[in-house]
């Protein structure tokens, strides 16, 4: 169970420089089962908390500090958000462009004892994860421009995501 991806109140939220609305993108087959094309077009808000980046109806927080995956997830939860679910090519490119040469934990993990990679909403990821033969169960994005398996216990930066208001 994860907290809702909405902030608890408007406290700390400020309008971003980006305005307007945007519709959901279709998901390529590898980013999860090709389901999102069934979703209706809908409008999103444009307001994010301070120090969060707005993009296509979502707010993203890029940490400067580093933590293990579990602590990163807990931090996002305290902000009323989750680790980022990077399930479209466009979203991946946007986040990688900001990540630059740093590696950031995202909300993609492999359950110990299960071969499948899943997003933290439990949906299956059908794409390629590099370094997964090393028994790493968490994933980072950034420097290599791919989904990289990483040790959940090693500290990395992380990306939180929530719906814009």
């Amino acid at each position: 169970y994860f907290p809702q991806v909405f902030g608890k109140s408007n406290d700390g939220f400020v309008p971003t420089e980006s305005y307007g609305t945007t519709s959901v993108q279709n998901v390529s087959q590898i980013f999860g089962r090709n389901d999102e094309s069934t979703m209706p077009t809908r409008s999103y808000g444009t307001v994010c908390p301070r120090n969060w980046d707005f993009h296509q109806g979502k707010c993203f927080f890029f940490s400067f500090s580093e933590s293990p995956w579990k602590d990163s997830m807990d931090y996002c939860a305290t902000q009323g958000s989750t680790l980022a679910i990077v399930n479209t090519p466009e979203k991946l490119k946007y986040l990688q462009d900001i990540a630059g040469i740093e590696n950031y934990f995202i909300g993609l993990v492999r359950q110990p004892g299960e071969k499948k990679w899943r997003w933290i909403n439990n949906s299956v990821f059908n794409g390629n994860v590099t370094n997964q033969d090393q028994n790493f169960d968490c994933v980072t994005i950034g420097l290599t421009k791919t989904y990289d398996a990483a040790s959940c216990e090693v500290s990395y930066r992380w990306i939180c995501e929530m719906n814009a208001k």
């Epitope: 991806v5 492999r110 359950q111 004892g113 499948k116 439990n122």
Partner: antibody, heavy 124, light 111 residues
Framework: QSLEESGGGLVKPEGSLTLTCKAS?????????MCWVRQAPGKGLEWIAC????????TVYASWAKGRFTISKTSSTTVTLQMTSLTAADTATYLC?????????????????WGPGTLVTVSS | ALVMTQTPSSVSAAVGGTVTIKCQAS??????LAWYQQKPGQPPKLLMF???DLASGVPSRFKGSGSGTEYTLTISDLEPADAATYFC?????????????FGGGTEVVVK
């Protein structure tokens, strides 16, 4: 590997009852969530609550179950469900079920092991 | 709340025939769907997960399909032992408390 429920029976309205689920062939540890699901006579399945079997004991409840139902891990092989303020609508077979899951990784997926259930009848 | 609507409530077919059971979610559940078989007096048994993956020991006569909000369980070459009630369940975590929603069930009668 198996699960067995106990503690069911006849209880009066507004009464309380505690059900127990005992695991055999495995221990309640990391990688599992233990859950309770109920089934009214001739009806469908209704999820009640889950508890992470690892050390954190994280719990999650169906919204309708909060306050009247409490799930607990009482040993390395047992989970309980405390029920209060029971009404006739709570009459059902209560099933213990196991889910693959790790609180550190967020996954609580499908139920891959079930007990046979214990019948709870609420009647005056 | 996430609601799973299962149809039909009952279906009948002859031995060797085929039955199709549908499950519709009130929102996109991204293939986080399981199917269970329950016989009278017994607990449910996992048949399928992630919409189309067979659980261990389940014959390939059982086939799951679907995406988005629409999912189907197809049982072909029906056998008498397939007579049971079938339930769908989603484990999609949308961030709300109401996880693990079940469909209402479909009774399969084998003639």
């Amino acid at each position: 590997q198996s699960l067995e429920e106990s503690g069911g029976g006849l209880v009066k309205p507004e009464g309380s009852l505690t059900l127990t689920c005992k695991a055999s062939g495995f221990t309640l540890s990391s990688y599992y969530y233990m859950c309770w699901v109920r089934q009214a006579p001739g009806k469908g399945l209704e999820w009640i609550a889950c508890i992470y079997a690892g050390s954190s004991g994280t719990t999650v409840y169906a919204s309708w179950a909060k306050g009247r139902f409490t799930i607990s891990k009482t040993s390395s092989t047992t989970v309980t469900l405390q029920m209060t303020s029971l009404t006739a609508a709570d009459t059902a077979t209560y099933l213990c079920a196991r889910k693959l899951g790790d609180v550190g990784y967020g996954h609580t997926t499908y139920f891959n092991l079930w007990g046979p259930g214990t019948l709870v009848t609420v009647s005056s | 709340a996430l609601v799973m609507t299962q149809t039909p409530s009952s279906v009948s077919a002859a031995v060797g025939g085929t039955v199709t059971i549908k499950c519709q979610a009130s929102q996109n559940i991204y293939s986080t769907l399981a199917w269970y078989q329950q016989k009278p007096g017994q607990p449910p048994k996992l048949l399928m997960f992630d919409a189309s993956d067979l659980a261990s020991g389940v014959p390939s006569r059982f086939k799951g399909s679907g995406s988005g909000t629409e999912y189907t369980l197809t049982i072909s070459d029906l056998e008498p032992a397939d007579a049971a009630t079938y339930f769908c369940q989603t484990y999609y975590d949308s961030g709300s408390d109401d996880l693990n929603a079940f469909g209402g069930g479909t009774e399969v009668v084998v003639k």
